[in-house]
């Protein structure tokens, strides 16, 4: 039978290219059976993950899965970095893989790099 443990479906080493100034939603897909767990987002600073306290978050419910969403409205250059979601379930802490946002600073619309250009040049962001 299917496990009733909470599972967080962020892929290992997932990455996103996003533009400063745009809105962006970072999703943490959560599978649970009965009671929805308490979920939080944190941002990695070296080996420490710093909890994001004062950020807009929301839940989106779908048939087989729920999404805990961290809102960036808008994306800022210092949003660049790696994030992780965590769930408290039966006094256990379940951590997701980290996901990395590569923020490209806003240029004029005509100079904006394509998604593929951004994907191929993450070192520009450091």
């Amino acid at each position: 039978k299917e496990s009733c443990d909470v599972q967080l479906y962020i892929k290992r080493q997932s990455e996103h290219s996003i533009l400063a100034g745009d809105p962006f939603e970072l999703e943490c897909p959560v599978k649970y059976c009965a009671n929805r767990p308490h979920v939080t987002w944190c941002k990695l600073n070296g080996t420490t993950c710093v909890k994001l306290e004062d950020r807009q978050t929301s839940w989106k419910e779908e048939k087989n899965i729920s999404f805990f969403i961290l809102h960036f409205e808008p994306v800022l250059p210092n949003d660049n970095g790696s994030y992780r979601c965590s769930a408290n379930f039966q006094s256990n802490l379940i951590e997701s893989h980290s996901t990395t946002l590569y923020v490209t600073d806003v240029k004029s619309a005509s100079e904006r790099p394509s998604k593929d250009e951004m994907a191929s040049r993450p070192w520009l962001l450091y």
Epitope: K11, R12, S14, E15, H97, A119
Partner: antibody, heavy 119, light 112 residues
């Protein structure tokens, strides 16, 4: 079970481009990463790059940066690898592969596509 | 880039032999999640590679139990406890910890 089927062999002129396709079945590719590896005749394996089909983010080995383009079409469960400015040293079998993005619980390779670059 | 070095590059053995192939990485493959992303592939002539082992020691489904993997940090081994005729092939290690992914140069296992 997860399966990958690649497009057929290609013969190309130096300086031209080739685009190889790789169609997945038995898996939702949003939950995977798809990657490309090549093998020159009698040689070892060389990683070209990978794509996250969920968001289109592609990552490349530096050697292929700017010359390889990996894309994915979620609606057809197909990944593509285009290699431009072909030279004779690009003659190789090109493999696509797919693996589970969460737990790495599966890793399946396509049958390979022979690309021959010759004038 | 992480360099992956396999030894030996070729090996002659007989059916029933116990065989060990080693793989050394130029830096630790231990990821921040505490796992080492070291895989072993088998490739037969004219065929696509097939993953045998992942996360150092986990066997892929359908892989016979005579195959085993071990190691940590930078040193890893693939062991075949009792060679069968279908095991004669080329074996590659490769790392999935850092980008770019990198492969060992391969070990060709031949019949003595």
């Amino acid at each position: 079970q997860v399966q990958l089927v690649q497009s057929g062999a290609e013969v190309k002129k130096p300086g031209s481009s080739v685009k190889v396709s790789c169609k997945a079945s038995g898996v939702n590719i949003k939950d995977t990463y798809m990657y490309w590896v090549r093998q020159a005749p009698g040689q070892g394996l060389e990683w070209i790059g990978r794509i996250d089909p969920a968001n289109g983010y592609a990552r490349y080995a530096q050697k292929f940066q700017g010359r390889a383009t990996i894309t994915a079409d979620e609606s057809t469960s197909t990944a593509y690898m285009e290699l431009s400015s072909l030279r004779s040293e690009d003659t190789a079998v090109y493999y696509c592969a797919v693996y589970d993005g969460y737990y790495e619980s599966f890793d399946v390779w396509g049958q390979g596509t022979l690309v021959t670059v010759s004038s | 880039d992480i360099q992956m070095t396999q030894s030996p590059s070729s090996l002659s053995a007989s059916v029933g032999d116990r065989v060990t192939i080693t793989c050394r990485s130029s830096q630790s493959l231990l990821d921040s999640d505490g796992k080492s992303y070291l895989n072993w592939l088998q490739q037969k002539p004219g065929k696509a590679p097939k993953r045998l082992i992942y996360l150092v020691s986990k066997l892929d489904s359908g892989v016979p139990s005579r195959f085993s993997g071990s190691g940590s940090g930078t040193d890893f081994t693939l062991t075949i406890s009792s060679l069968q005729p279908e095991d004669f092939a080329t074996y590659y290690c490769w790392q999935g910890t850092l980008f770019p992914r990198t492969f060992g140069q391969g070990t060709k296992l031949e019949i003595k």
